[in-house]
Amino acid sequence: ECGHISVSAPIVHLGDPITASCIIKQNCSHLDPEPQILWRLGAELQPGGRQQRLSDGTQESIITLPHLNHTQAFLSCCLNWGNSLQILDQVELRAGYPPAIPHNLSCLMNLTTSSLICQWEPGPETHLPTSFTLKSFKSRGNCQTQGDSILDCVPKDGQSHCCIPRKHLLLYQNMGIWVQAENALGTSMSPQLCLDPMDVVKLEPPMLRTMDPSPEAAPPQAGCLQLCWEPWQPGLHINQKCELRHKPQRGEASWALVGPLPLEALQYELCGLLPATAYTLQIRCIRWPLPGHWSDWSPSLELRTTERAPTVRLDTWWRQRQLDPRTVQLFWKPVPLEEDSGRIQGYVVSWRPSGQAGAILPLCNTTELSCTFHLPSEAQEVALVAYNSAGTSRPTPVVFSESRGPALTRLHAMARDPHSLWVGWEPPNPWPQGYVIEWGLGPPSASNSNKTWRMEQNGRATGFLLKENIRPFQLYEIIVTPLYQDTMGPSQHVYAYSQEMAPSHAPELHLKHIGKTWAQLEWVPEPPELGKSPLTHYTIFWTNAQNQSFSAILNASSRGFVLHGLEPASLYHIHLMAASQAGATNSTVLTLMTLTPEGSELH
């Protein structure tokens, strides 16, 4: 061994200086008598070594590294040997920090494993091997006086928790507990906890179960859940308070908390929930009024709330078949009476014959919003209900009566925009209770079954905006019927477009006769098209060779026109414009030449 390094300290604070010396023995005869000692930190040569020959003939080089900024590195003492660097000795240097004070020390007592589990946060990285030890002692008082020491608890490498087994614990008696951190640069200790293991007990949660329905017990109300829990038996004698949390399975709702509940409640009716909704529920408990830790949340229980019977008003409307007045088509619309009005599974139309107490005759059961049935000859009234698994809505009576009320007047309609129509009227006297407004495609596409309808509950209304099922360029028939206490008034109807289309093309012009100064033209009118408003007029335009233009306006029933005052032997361009309220379209251009003065008239 030719060389030897000694260092001021092999482990230092990161960034601190370090001094090293390397001594080369004299008996390394194969060396240059005056060898130059070089220093290397890791792979980098370090300048600044001060070399001297000592009295015993050895060579010494001393170097001071002003800042050791590597957490780990090898410092080598070297000589040039031929063309290569010969390492004579090397030492491992480490730099880091003394341990920070461990913080957030907390413990919990697990009654199943019979151990006190303590955990802490070790603080920032020291870059050095650092050991943690959980230290504790038994104490009669508030840990001011130390009793028997408890065997140190050393966590597995890298872990920041440790378990003190039951044999080292005394329940209902205080223990002093702290964490000691130690490395080559120092020792630190956490603040001491003084605790009775029972005061940090963490219980197991109860098991949630659905309550078995008993025959004599009333079923839960709508929006309610009946549930029970099975306490964790080993914790049964510990007074606890519990809390439930619940949220709908669907959607993004956050948990809602219910509590405190006594552990002993064992069963509970949770209300104020959405009806017919699947919920996830969990429970947890804590020792109380004595100190403790909350248990984990229990495994989830999934339950569905019961429905509520539909709370809706059913607006109804009916019409009889022309050929068979006993065949009735009944229409209805559910109007929610509350924000959550209950799911509707279907509808039933029924009739109770007079004199037959209790006997109800169903006429139809449907999920649709209308049904057609044969009305028994003695029936003047039927009942309509909406239903679901929880029950039915309040029955809506539908009375079939003759039209005996006064009619409304001045029914008119006008377009608001391409997808809505305003229908207005003058209310009759006396005021009706309301109106039924029906609308659907007018002729030739008219169909009774495809009509949309709405109930206007305000008898003083003088109009209604139709926004459903209105498309541009379609002719609509709108029917309004006033409704009275036990009867209705006659229906009135009006036709309207929400938006009309300009004529798609104008009729083709044909020359019928021509002379020197006149020309007779004719055309065949286009047949009327659905969605296109009727023609209001035609305009005929003609232009001479000098680009002078002339025109004449003709009424919509015109089939021809004679141009007078033309120049003989002259060229003219003529076209016809067909116009409606929605716009106008031009025909193709007809070009003609009037006859020469000596020519004969053409017929």
């Epitope: 019979s114 039951r166 329940l171 080993p234 049964l236 004698h237 002993e264 064992l266 009024p289």
Partner: antibody, heavy 118, light 107 residues
């Protein structure tokens, strides 16, 4: 000092009824589970029933289920055991016990003798 | 139900002897095991709760150990006042159950 004092024992005919009481003092009665344990002459200990601090939970031994009812009056610091349809095998010394948080009988009364005989 | 089996059912020992009584549960009960001492004509007295915790006022010669299914009560040096019957009891699960008892007699 924690004390439990049973009363109400005595001789009763088979099929008869008896109500035992246990007066508690020296601790906050309403915070603790309480229980009844019996010991037939010359035999070991047998747990009979327990009751939670507020009275909501009342487990029973199978041998007395449906015949005995445990109850408590926290305002009077008193524990009760109503015994109906008594049988000869119910003959025993009945002890009232204060239960600790981990289910141990931390304090016991001196016991009251119930004899069921015709 | 959890069965508790105590052994021996009786033993004879002298003052100063070290005495060990065992109790076995038919299923795991963690540390939920309590030991009682009963003298003739008296109520039982709690010695050890939760397997190894000495009840206040109980002499330190009594100690308990074990967990799961096997438990031991040890009297390190038997005293004249220790001659009595000893019972173990589980409080892990209802119904609460006792062992059959171990009678410690003077040799």
């Amino acid at each position: 000092e924690v004390q439990l004092l049973e009363s109400g024992g005595g001789l009763v005919q088979p099929g008869g009824s008896l109500r035992l009481s246990c007066a508690a003092s020296g601790f906050t009665f309403s915070l603790y589970w309480m229980g009844w344990v019996r010991q037939a002459p010359g035999k070991g200990l047998e747990w009979v029933s327990s009751i939670s601090s507020s009275g909501g939970v009342t487990p029973y031994a199978d041998s007395v289920k449906g015949r005995f009812t445990i109850s408590r009056d926290n305002s009077k610091n008193t524990l009760y055991l109503q015994m109906n349809s008594l049988r000869a095998e119910d003959t025993a010394v009945y002890y009232c016990a204060k239960l600790g948080e981990l289910g141990s009988g931390s304090t016991w009364g001196q016991g009251t003798l119930v004899t069921v005989s015709s | 139900d959890i069965q508790m089996t105590q052994s021996p059912s009786s033993l004879s020992a002298s003052v100063g002897d070290r005495v060990t009584i065992t109790c076995r549960a038919s299923q795991g009960i963690s540390s939920y095991l309590n030991w009682y001492q009963q003298k003739p004509g008296k109520a039982p007295k709690l010695l050890i709760y939760y397997a190894s915790n000495l009840q206040n006022g109980v002499p330190s010669r009594f100690s308990g150990s074990g967990s799961g299914t096997d438990f031991t009560l040890t009297i390190s040096s038997l005293q004249p006042e220790d001659f009595a019957t000893y019972y173990c009891q589980q409080s892990w699960h209802y119904p609460l159950t006792f062992g059959g008892g171990t009678k410690v007699e003077i040799k």
